[in-house]
Interface confidence: low
């Protein structure tokens, strides 16, 4: 049994008489055998749940839900209730409606097994029927909504009647129907003006009825019509299984370049035309479980569940339905010498569903790890400026693919053949896993011996210590020209164009500092900086050469304080400033401010 | 009570064809795997296929890929063995099974007869 | 494919005894085995499934025991009943195969 609404509304005046019905309340059954039975909770509580005092002044037939005066409620009794409720003026009192056999504690009041009753109490006695509006004779102030569960037995679930109208207007005629759809399922009957369900309920053909009701009020010559929203929720249980859109029950996936821990191998998705179980439940009662296969699959995949919520479109309307998707994801990172094809099994069991069938579904993940083979292009040939400085990025190495691995560690080394001409220095880049080449020794650049460099690339696997290796050949060009005197160690240093271009800084391939102009467009990510090479700094991203130095592009790598208009980076540098950004990497700050108007012949006339 | 029927056995010429069906009933067919499994005379059990719940997918010995087809119409609670290009070896009594949804066969048809010879 | 070999391809005994048939995969199949009897005539039945577990309405005196290479099925005391061609088959990956069986005889 269940109630149709969790609440209900009715007005209530000082000395209305003992005996005044006031209003139903209504079961509807979850099996066609049971018969309700009403209980009214003890206590009549006010503002904030507050318990006001024991009920002595409603009833309610327990067969029929009538709720009805016992007796008088008079303005001593109001002044006595009125003092219990926290100083806060009382409007409003509510009693509890319960449904048996429920437990006879009265406790927390929740929906189905329990109904809240509001009373509105106004301080003086029912008006006089002349005087009453329309709307007042036809509906309560508040509008009903209903809930009515799907595939229940059909039964009645409101009553249209405003009792104390009818109880004290008798001379009052009012009539009500239902505007509704071609067969809907729902009926008024016209002596009782009961509301009822024809039939069961589907919820997966409808989720919601936006009904009208219409109430026409005769009094003497007047007919007046009042139409209100009449809204019906149906509510949802677990009658279907769960299944494969399309049929898909298969997803074949290959494990070759990302091999990192937690990636998403593959997804199945399945579709449920139910909403239950909620979302707090869902995913302990809709689980999957991985079906055990070999021990290496075990450990090296598991299934996440991604529940949502999604639209159905059902007999024109649209209802909610469930999709899940199952990942198939990387337990760990997986060695690039794994190289096995495997068949997993995922059973999924919507334990809620009581069929007919079975809540069961079986997903099935074809899954090839192929092993990654290390491959140099046979040769590099780079050219280097003779002038340029220390962190200098001049190029990268990168094995066959890198730009597609992850969770495969390839550390790469560069071993010279001239023993005084190591210039180069090399470092793996964690976010394509290439080897950023760059200068390391700036004096060996202007060994006049050192005019061709050659190396041999060396790149290791770290987990399996497999290698490839490649001929690098470097090519110094140009002649050395000395630093400029009072040059500072980093370009973001300079805050103008014409200082920053005359020196040079650590990183700068060409010895030479360069200016990026911004585009002037408020707090932006293009603002204006002095750097050692627009190509890689400022970039939002401090690379693993800018992180050997913070002179090299502080922009990108300072931890300490940005003053000025300024979002800061994540989880260092500047993300975006305002003008133009320069920055004292000795001090740790940054500053941000308007672009400088140069203008000569402005600085003339400001004289 | 599960049920399997198997049917469509006979005596069929090499390089000929036969469909073998199998008819389901006493358990919601749509949500299990089958399978087939054949039994030449005298001799042990052999797997042939096998077809997931939807159909989507499907499984096959290396001796029968290519010449067998095995299908399912779960409106009609029925599973299929398409045989062609039969050989002597195909000779062999063939059985429908349910498969549990650990891969288990829990439920077999009687088998069907289907010889091939000339 | 996954090889399995039974062994004793043929076993004479007598009602009372307790023997042990032993069924080796060709690669680990963790737990994923199963054993069958056939009695004459009829389709195989299942006794054993994931290695050890005995399928509902199996006499107690059948039991499994092993893990990925080698797997046993042991009957404590032979019943006249018992005696029929045994198979033991992996379902870790397809193609799903059967060991080429063992026959139990009455001695």
């Known amino acids: 049994l269940y109630f149709s609404r969790d609440a209900y509304w009715e007005k209530l005046y000082v000395d209305q008489a003992a005996g005044t019905p006031l209003l139903y309340v209504h079961a509807l059954r979850d099996a066609p055998e049971e018969v309700p039975s009403f209980r009214l909770g003890q206590h009549l509580y006010g503002t904030y749940r507050t318990r006001l005092h024991e009920n002595n002044w409603i009833c309610i037939q327990e067969d029929t839900g009538l709720l009805y005066l016992n007796r008088s409620l008079d303005h001593s009794s109001w002044e006595k209730l009125s003092v219990r409720n926290r100083g806060f003026p009382l409007l409003t009192v509510y009693l509890k409606v319960f449904l048996s056999p429920t437990s006879l504690r009265e406790g927390e009041c929740q929906w189905p097994g329990c109904a809240r009753v509001y009373f509105s109490f106004f301080n003086t006695s029912f008006p006089a029927c002349s005087s009453l509006k329309p709307r007042e004779l036809c509906f309560p102030e508040t509008r009903p909504s209903f809930r009515i569960r799907e595939n229940r037995p059909p039964g009645t679930f409101h009553q249209f009647r405003l009792l104390p109208v009818q109880f004290l207007c008798p001379n009052i005629s009012v009539a009500y129907r239902l505007l509704e759809g071609e067969g809907l399922p729902f009926r008024c009957a016209p002596d009782s003006l009961e509301v009822s369900t024809r039939w069961a309920l589907d919820r997966e053909q409808r989720e919601k009825y936006e009904l009208v009701a219409v109430c026409t009020v005769h009094a003497g010559a007047r007919e007046e019509v009042v139409m209100v929203p009449f809204p019906v929720t149906v509510y949802d249980e677990d009658d279907s299984a769960p299944t494969f859109p399309a049929g898909v029950d298969t997803a074949s996936a290959v494990v070759e370049f990302k091999r990192k821990e937690d990636t998403v191998v593959a997804t199945l998705r399945v579709f449920d035309a139910d909403v239950v179980p909620a979302s707090g439940e869902l995913v302990r009662r809709y689980t999957s479980t991985l079906l055990p296969g070999d021990t290496w699959a075990q450990q090296t995949f598991r299934v996440e569940h991604w529940p949502n919520e999604t639209s159905v479109q059902a007999n024109g309307s649209f209802v909610r339905a469930t999709v899940h998707d199952y990942r198939l994801v990387l337990n760990r990172n997986l060695s690039i010498s794994e190289n096995r094809t495997m068949q997993l099994a995922v059973l999924v069991n919507d334990s809620d569903f009581q069929g007919p069938g079975a809540g069961v579904l079986l997903l099935h993940f074809n899954v090839s790890v192929l092993p990654v083979s290390l491959h140099l292009p046979s040769t590099y040939s780079l050219s280097v400026s003779r002038r340029a400085r220390r962190f200098a990025q001049i190029g990268k190495v990168c094995v066959e693919n890198c730009q597609a691995f992850s969770g495969i560690n390839v550390q790469y080394k560069l071993h010279s053949s001239g023993a005084n001409c190591s210039t180069l220095g090399v470092v793996t880049s964690a976010e394509d896993t290439s080897g950023i080449l760059f200068v390391n020794d700036t004096k060996a650049l202007r060994r006049p011996k050192c005019a061709e460099l050659h190396y041999m690339v060396v790149a290791t696997d770290q987990q399996t210590s497999r290698q490839a290796q490649a001929q690098l050949l470097v090519t110094v060009e140009g002649s050395y020209v000395a630093e400029e005197a009072g040059c500072p160690l980093s370009c973001a240093v300079s805050k103008r164009r014409l200082e920053c271009e005359e020196c040079g800084g650590l990183g700068s391939p060409t010895g030479r500092c360069e200016w990026r102009q911004g585009d002037g467009k408020g707090i932006t990510r293009n603002f204006s900086t002095c750097s050692p090479s627009t190509k890689t700094c400022p970039d939002g991203h401090c690379d693993v050469v800018e992180t050997q130095d913070i002179n090299i592009c502080p922009q990108d790598c300072l931890r300490g304080s940005i003053v000025g208009g300024h979002e800061p980076g994540e989880p260092r540098g500047i993300k975006a400033g305002y003008g133009t950004c320069n920055c004292f990497p000795e001090e740790e700050k940054c500053f941000c401010e308007p672009e400088d108007i140069q203008d000569p012949l402005c600085d003339e006339l400001c004289r | 009570e599960v049920q399997l029927v198997e049917s469509g056995g006979a005596l069929v010429q090499p390089g000929g064809s036969l469909r073998l069906s199998c008819a389901a009933s006493?358990?919601?067919?749509?949500?299990?795997?089958m399978t087939w499994v054949r039994q030449a005379p005298g001799m042990g059990l052999e797997w042939v296929s096998g077809i997931s719940s939807s159909g989507a997918s499907t499984f096959y010995a290396d001796s029968v890929k290519g010449r067998f087809t095995i299908s399912r119409d779960n409106s009609k609670n029925t599973l299929y063995l398409q045989m062609n290009s039969l050989r002597a070896e195909d000779t062999a009594v063939y059985y429908c099974?349910?498969?549990?949804?650990?891969?288990?066969?829990?439920?077999w048809g009687q088998g069907t007869l289907v010889t091939v010879s000339s | 494919d996954i090889q399995l070999t039974q062994s004793p391809s043929f076993l004479s005994a007598s009602v009372g005894d307790r023997v042990t048939i032993t069924c080796w995969a060709s690669?680990?199949?963790?737990?994923?085995l199963a054993w069958y009897q056939q009695e004459p005539g009829k389709a195989p039945k299942v006794l054993i499934y994931?290695?050890?577990t005995l399928q509902s309405g199996v006499p107690s005196r059948f039991s499994g025991s092993g893990s990925g290479t080698e797997f046993t099925l042991t009957i404590s005391s032979l019943q006249p009943e018992d005696f029929a061609p045994y198979y033991c088959?992996?379902?870790?990956?397809?193609?799903?195969?059967f060991g080429q069986g063992t026959k139990l005889e009455i001695k």
């Open positions: 099974a349910k498969e549990d949804y650990w891969g288990w066969f829990d439920y």
């Open positions: 994931d290695a050890s």
């Open positions: 690669q680990d199949v963790s737990s994923y």
């Open positions: 006493g358990f919601t067919f749509s949500n299990y795997a």
């Open positions: 088959q992996q379902l870790n990956s397809y193609p799903y195969t």
